[in-house]
């Protein structure tokens, strides 16, 4: 706590200006009126206050607004935002996308801090859902943002917001997250024609079920190996050799290099060796000729 001392004669601040950088900590505390500071927050960023002085200014705002800052102040916090704790931010009610952008700009180039994560959480909860404009903004600042959300949180993303998602935004998503996002993407892009649809849906395919992969195999999409390797193993296993060949098109040759890795390895084990040989890639490990394949999962379902 800063001791309460009287402001020296002639030092009372009439406005927030650069003369304040010469004030000692106690002088700032004593001579700057919190209400004046609140109305002139936009000036703070143009003045090279030290970190110590910013601590004093924050303290003054905390005293003025013990229940949390109003949005008119939050919007102009600028670098003072970096001084806020998640506890401070939980008291805020941020509704304007412009305010969110202004604060994200301050943290630009840095990893997502606990403060930023709390701010985003407060903003999204206040809006009720992750709308397209918000998602656009968040992924522009933090490409990995979407993949930091839980499947439950992702369920509040409306399909219309999926248009804002770029392939790199999904780089760190795990299968559980893609399971939630894929149906939304499928819905969002449903009116596009074949080739355009595939370009848009490609990065979401880690959440696609077998029947959708079978459908894609009929559309000459030429899926690349990188995308194929990210598909759900359980969705790939039921595909026939002919379906995989159609799905990959000229990229089918890449299976050889990936034959020891999932899902290719597991898929090979489920195919007849005769069928694998038709690819002419030298893939080994399929079911030998003359062996009978029992689908035990089917039998269990019937009983």
């Amino acid at each position: 706590e800063v001791e309460k001392t009287a402001c020296p004669s002639g030092k009372k601040a009439r406005e927030i200006d650069e003369s304040l950088i010469f004030y000692k900590k106690w002088e700032l505390e004593a001579c700057v009126d919190a209400a004046l500071l609140a109305t002139q927050m936009d000036r703070v960023n143009a003045i090279p206050f030290t970190y110590e002085q910013l601590d004093v200014l924050k303290h003054k705002l905390d005293e003025l607004y013990p229940q949390g800052y109003p949005e008119s102040v939050i919007q102009h916090l600028g670098y003072l935002f970096l001084k806020m704790s998640p506890e401070d931010i939980r008291k805020w009610n941020v509704t304007s996308l412009e305010t969110l952008k202004a604060l994200l700009e301050v943290n630009k180039g840095h990893e997502m801090s606990p403060q930023v994560a709390t701010l985003i959480d407060r903003f999204v909860k206040g809006r009720g859902q992750l709308d397209k404009d918000t998602l656009d903004t968040l992924t522009a600042f933090y490409p990995g943002y979407l993949c930091s959300l839980s499947p439950e949180e992702l369920s509040s993303v409306p399909p219309s917001s999926i248009w804002a998602v770029r392939p790199q935004d999904l780089d760190t998503c795990d299968p559980r997250q893609l399971d939630v996002l894929y149906p939304k993407a499928r819905l969002a892009f449903q009116n596009m024609n074949g080739s355009e649809y595939f370009v848009k849906i490609q990065s979401f395919l880690g959440g696609a079920p077998t029947e959708d992969l079978k459908a894609l195999s009929q559309q000459n999409v030429s899926m690349d190996l990188a995308t194929f390797m990210k598909l759900r193993t359980d969705a790939v296993l039921p595909l026939t050799v002919a379906e995989v060949q159609k799905l990959l098109g000229p990229h089918v040759e890449g299976l050889k290099a990936e034959e020891r890795h999932r899902p290719v390895r597991d898929w090979i084990l489920r195919q007849r060796q005769d069928d694998l040989d038709t690819l002419g890639l030298g893939l080994q490990g399929g079911i030998p000729n003359g062996y009978l394949v029992l689908d035990l999962s089917m039998q269990e379902a019937l009983s």
């Epitope: 650069e18 003045i47 090279p48 970190y51 110590e52 670098y79 970096l82």
Partner: antibody, heavy 122, light 107 residues
Framework: QVQLQESGPGLVKPSQTLSLTCTVS??????????WNWIRQHPGQCLEWIGY???????YSNPSLKSLFTISLDTSKNQFSLKLSSVTAADTAVYYC??????????????WGQGTMVTVSS | EIQMTQSPSSLSASVGDRVTITCQAS??????LNWYQLKPGKAPKLLIQ???SLQGGVPSRFSGSGSGTDFTLTISSLQPEDFATYYC?????????FGCGTKVEIK
């Protein structure tokens, strides 16, 4: 990349004025995100921060120093300068110019000049 | 003003040694502490900022830690090019102040 180079007389007589210039190359002195500093080191002693100038022209000199320093900016030449009038032997030191990072407040000195030795002697 | 006290003022070490330098501030400076390397006739070099953030291009054998008043610079395995003088500096309040340096010499 950005480089800083100090220049000025190596020898100054007592009571005269010391003028040093720091030339910035590879970047603009008037771009935001940085501030420009002078630092000195007396022979065998600690580093001592003299003061800064911001691209906006705001200056701050170390109030703990006995000497009166003036720091100025010449954006047309991409230079900033240090002036010290009425020098004494106590001002003999290696003088460095340095660029400071601004991370919401003035912060670390990320690029320095090699330093220039100034001797005050008659 | 904030006083910065560095220790030791000098040390002798061999290549491959682990070296630790400490810096103490006269008041709480949070994590606003920077470390520099100085070699005669060369431009000083920023090694670490904000107590523990390694500056780009600085080898990972350098690391920093601490918060509040007590800080440490560690060189995990000393290399021939690391023999120099190291300074800490606080950027919490003006006037900015430095420690008086630690000279790392060859044993």
């Amino acid at each position: 990349q950005v480089q800083l180079q100090e220049s000025g007389p190596g020898l100054v007589k007592p009571s005269q004025t010391l003028s040093l210039t720091c030339t910035v190359s590879g970047g603009s002195i008037s771009s935001g995100g940085y501030y420009w500093n002078w630092i000195r080191q007396h022979p065998g002693q600690c580093l001592e921060w003299i003061g800064y100038i911001f691209y906006s022209g705001i200056t701050y000199s170390n109030p703990s120093l006995k000497s009166l320093f003036t720091i100025s900016l010449d954006t047309s030449k991409n230079q900033f300068s240090l002036k010290l009038s009425s020098v004494t032997a106590a001002d003999t030191a290696v003088y460095y110019c340095a660029r400071g990072l601004v991370r919401g407040a003035p912060d670390a000195f990320d690029i320095w000049g090699q330093g220039t030795m100034v001797t005050v002697s008659s | 003003e904030i006083q910065m006290t560095q220790s030791p003022s000098s040390l002798s070490a061999s290549v491959g040694d682990r070296v630790t330098i400490t810096c103490q501030a006269s008041q709480d400076i949070s994590n606003y502490l920077n470390w520099y390397q100085l070699k005669p006739g060369k431009a000083p070099k920023l090694l670490i900022q904000a107590a523990s953030s390694l500056q780009g291009g600085v080898p990972s054998r350098f690391s920093g830690s601490g918060s509040g008043t007590d800080f440490t610079l560690t060189i995990s395995s000393l290399q021939p090019e690391d023999f120099a003088t190291y300074y800490c500096q606080q950027s919490y309040s003006t006037p900015f102040t430095f420690g008086c340096g630690t000279k790392v010499e060859i044993k």
